[in-house]
Interface confidence: low
Amino acid sequence: TIPPHVQKSVNNDMIVTDNNGAVKFPQLCKFCDVRFSTCDNQKSCMSNCSITSICEKPQEVCVAVWRKNDENITLETVCHDPKLPYHDFILEDAASPKCIMKEKKKPGETFFMCSCSSDECNDNIIFSEEYNTSNPDLLLVIFQ
């Protein structure tokens, strides 16, 4: 992915299509890499990342990674290709419009990760169980 500080007009000729043949152009994601965070014990948090980046490749989605250990809490926001693992995990929820955090097993820390496919969707990371993407009401709100 391009450095997040570089504002870039979309200029590559690669066209990626979804399963319905609809063209997907590069997405907008929060892209602050790893930053210290105060997000803890909340149903949802804002990233507090002021950098919005146009993802380098059309197939990339937004990703957020929340990590807590004995010393600190960090939040990572990036663009990433869902065909490739990130932190050794597959991005299972890349098609979701919202960034719904799911816990992953990592020794020595608490590790949550989410991915999503709407503009800047990794700006609002959701931990609450009530925001399950299998909830038809949520999908109705997003896709109406």
Epitope: S9, K24, I54, P58, D119, Q144
Partner: antibody
């Protein structure tokens, strides 16, 4: 049903200011980039500005840069265009439009408001 | 800025005719090309995005083709409600410029 309703247009003298508003309903406003496009009387369409869902990314046309400011209030589902130092050539119908979710911030606009007329004249 | 040039600027046609409007970009824009229809006193309406993808709810008589610098909007059988002005727009780079429009009038 997606609806976009512009307001705030009117007659203003050269050098004056106006603030346009666009009230959005029927969709999840905060995840859509929004644009302003204008059309001078009897002329074609001219893109003015775009703002991403959170307001984190903004672009302007060179013709309005430094004079116009786009903003949004996601809690009110409202898009704004603050227009300062207005000129006669800014006279146009101003449309607010929703950028379709085609992953390109300056991409196709799938829903448009009815427009509001701004007339700059002494 | 990328210049978009439409031709013709106007045309006269009859109901049932096949109508073709072309749009040329001043540099390659891949498939980042959209088509809009505008009727007098109304807002534009998206017909085609990404050069050839039909927007939801748009009749199948509208189709788009092309890539690079040359694009075409085709109306296979002109209907009374199709008399309007048509605009192309590139969304390859900022600013997303429009063509000057093609007015389709009744012969």
């Amino acid at each position: 049903e997606v609806q976009l309703v512009e307001s705030g247009g009117g007659l203003v003298q050269p050098g004056g200011s106006l603030r346009l508003s666009c009230a959005a309903s029927g969709f999840a406003f905060d995840i859509y980039a929004m644009t302003w496009v204008r059309q001078a009387p009897g002329k074609g369409l001219e893109w003015v500005s775009v703002i991403s869902g959170s307001g984190g990314t903004i672009y302007y046309a060179d013709s309005v840069k430094g004079r116009f400011t786009i903003s949004r209030d996601n809690s009110k589902n409202t898009l704004y265009l603050q227009m300062n130092s207005l000129r006669a050539e800014d006279t146009a119908v101003y449309y607010c439009a929703r950028r379709g979710q085609y992953r390109d911030i300056v991409g196709a606009t799938d829903y448009w408001g009815q427009g509001t007329l701004v007339t700059v004249s002494s | 800025d990328i210049q978009m040039t439409q031709s013709p600027s106007s045309l006269s046609a009859s109901v049932g005719d096949r109508v073709t409007i072309t749009c040329r970009a001043s540099q390659s824009i891949s498939s980042y090309l959209n088509w809009y229809q505008q009727k007098p006193g109304k807002a534009p309406k998206l017909l085609i995005y990404a050069a050839s993808s039909l927007q939801s709810g748009v009749p199948s008589r509208f189709s788009g083709s092309g890539s690079g610098t040359d694009f075409t909007l085709t109306i296979s059988s002109l209907q009374p409600e199709d008399f309007a002005t048509y605009y192309c727009q590139q969304s390859y780079s900022t600013p997303p410029t429009f063509g000057q429009g093609t007015k389709v009038e009744i012969k």
